[in-house]
Amino acid sequence: KEEQTTFRDCAEIFKSGLTTSGIYTLTFPNSTEEIKAYCDMDVGGGGWTVIQHREDGSVDFQRTWKEYKEGFGSPLGEYWLGNEFVSQLTGQHRYVLKIQLKDWEGNEAHSLYDHFYLAGEESNYRIHLTGLTGTAGKISSISQPGSDFSTKDSDNDKCICKCSQMLSGGWWFDACGPSNLNGQYYPQKQNTNKFNGIKWYYWKGSGYSLKATTMMIRPADF
């Protein structure tokens, strides 16, 4: 049997026998274009493609549409994998989305959606989510039905206020919605009463800015 040399996601890498967490090269579906991603091979059975990570505020997340489309940051630290890759990937097969959150008091929580995909750029990478379970709130902190993605230079939200500018970062803002994991990073003791922080309302409330977040995807049939 010929060994697979290109991988669409971290689940394929895991299944090939490479089961150590770290940076791997993935290939766009139906293309030779490559992208580097962090693969979490430890959490919940492994095979997770990390699409977003925040941990220390070292990377500026107030970026342009193009940067959110193509990705930015470092897969070893804070980064955004890229809307285009995620859209293409999740348009091919059914994926689940796991969101892991940490607060400043040492607590952790997660939200798991049993079906996640991003529409194409022509639909502003609108998010689609169903089937929420987990410990980070019984109600989805990503507005349902899903919103279009907005950035500081591409305002697709439902507010006259330009949510991305007011709340910082690119996100699926509604008007402006109960979450924003790409908001301004605030250190401990400065992380409360912040409209524009890293927010997951149905876990920590409106003004609380989180310490760390990870968004990761995996095929539903893994």
Partner: antibody
Framework: QVQLVQSGAEVKKPGSSVKVSCKAS????????ISWVRQAPGQGLEWMGR????????NYAQKFQGRVTITADKSTSTAYMELSSLRSEDTAVYYC????????????????WGQGTTVTVSS | DIVMTQSPLSLPVTPGEPASISCRSS???????????LDWYLQKPGQSPQLLIY???NRASGVPDRFSGSGSGTDFTLKISRVEAEDVGVYYC?????????FGGGTKVEIK
């Protein structure tokens, strides 16, 4: 386009209560804080309180605490403001208003207003 | 509570001339996101208030560009570059940083 339509004018006796309704149409209701603002004849605008329908939580200006109750019915997208122990000084136009962003994003200034409900308190 | 103070109380204006209204808050309305949570409203005679300027300096939809908002922290100004007859009414500033939301006392703009 969101619209807020309020109930009609009321004439009330001192000591009684009044309940004014505000029906939202043409947009999301539950996640926006509906505020009530009043204006006595020839006077300025005064914020009374607000409700967040999705949470069922209301908060009030200190001045009206204990005398005003703001509620909401999500099924009909209607907010209500009830003011009790009415006195002549409560004669005013009462407005409901909706902010330009949802409650998750801050208290918010108002970009959609009802047409106003005149409440006259007279013996 | 944040106290909002407006001046002048009354402003007689000549059509075509500029006009300026001042608003002061008892504490800063500048949030850490860089926005000032200060709105301006116009209430025309017999009408509900309408939003003119939001978050300090942003014109609401359909508001003519002769209206502009400026200022930061505790001192804010609404300017009308060339007053028109339809601009008459009472102008209010309002802080939207925290509840209770509080309004300035209003400035009545009338044609001379």
């Amino acid at each position: 386009q969101v619209q807020l339509v309020q109930s009609g004018a009321e004439v009330k006796k001192p000591g009684s209560s009044v309940k004014v309704s505000c029906k939202a149409s043409g947009g999301t209701f539950s996640s926006y804080a509906i505020s009530w603002v009043r204006q006595a004849p020839g006077q300025g605008l005064e914020w009374m309180g607000r409700i967040i329908p999705i949470l069922g939580i209301a908060n009030y200006a200190q001045k009206f605490q204990g005398r005003v109750t703001i509620t909401a019915d999500k099924s009909t997208s209607t907010a209500y403001m009830e003011l009790s122990s009415l006195r002549s000084e409560d004669t005013a136009v009462y407005y409901c208003a909706r902010p330009y962003y949802d409650f998750w994003s801050g208290p918010g200034g108002m970009d959609v207003w009802g047409q106003g409900t005149t409440v006259t308190v007279s013996s | 509570d944040i106290v909002m103070t407006q001046s002048p109380l009354s402003l007689p204006v000549t059509p075509g001339e500029p006009a300026s209204i001042s608003c002061r808050s008892s504490q800063s309305l500048l949030h850490s996101n860089g926005y000032n949570y200060l709105d301006w409203y116009l209430q025309k005679p017999g009408q509900s208030p309408q939003l003119l300027i939001y978050l300090g300096s942003n014109r609401a939809s359909g508001v003519p560009d002769r209206f502009s908002g400026s200022g930061s922290g505790t001192d804010f100004t609404l300017k009308i570059s060339r007053v028109e007859a339809e601009d008459v009414g009472v102008y209010y500033c309002m802080q939207a940083l925290q509840t209770p939301l509080t309004f300035g006392g209003g400035t009545k703009v009338e044609i001379k």
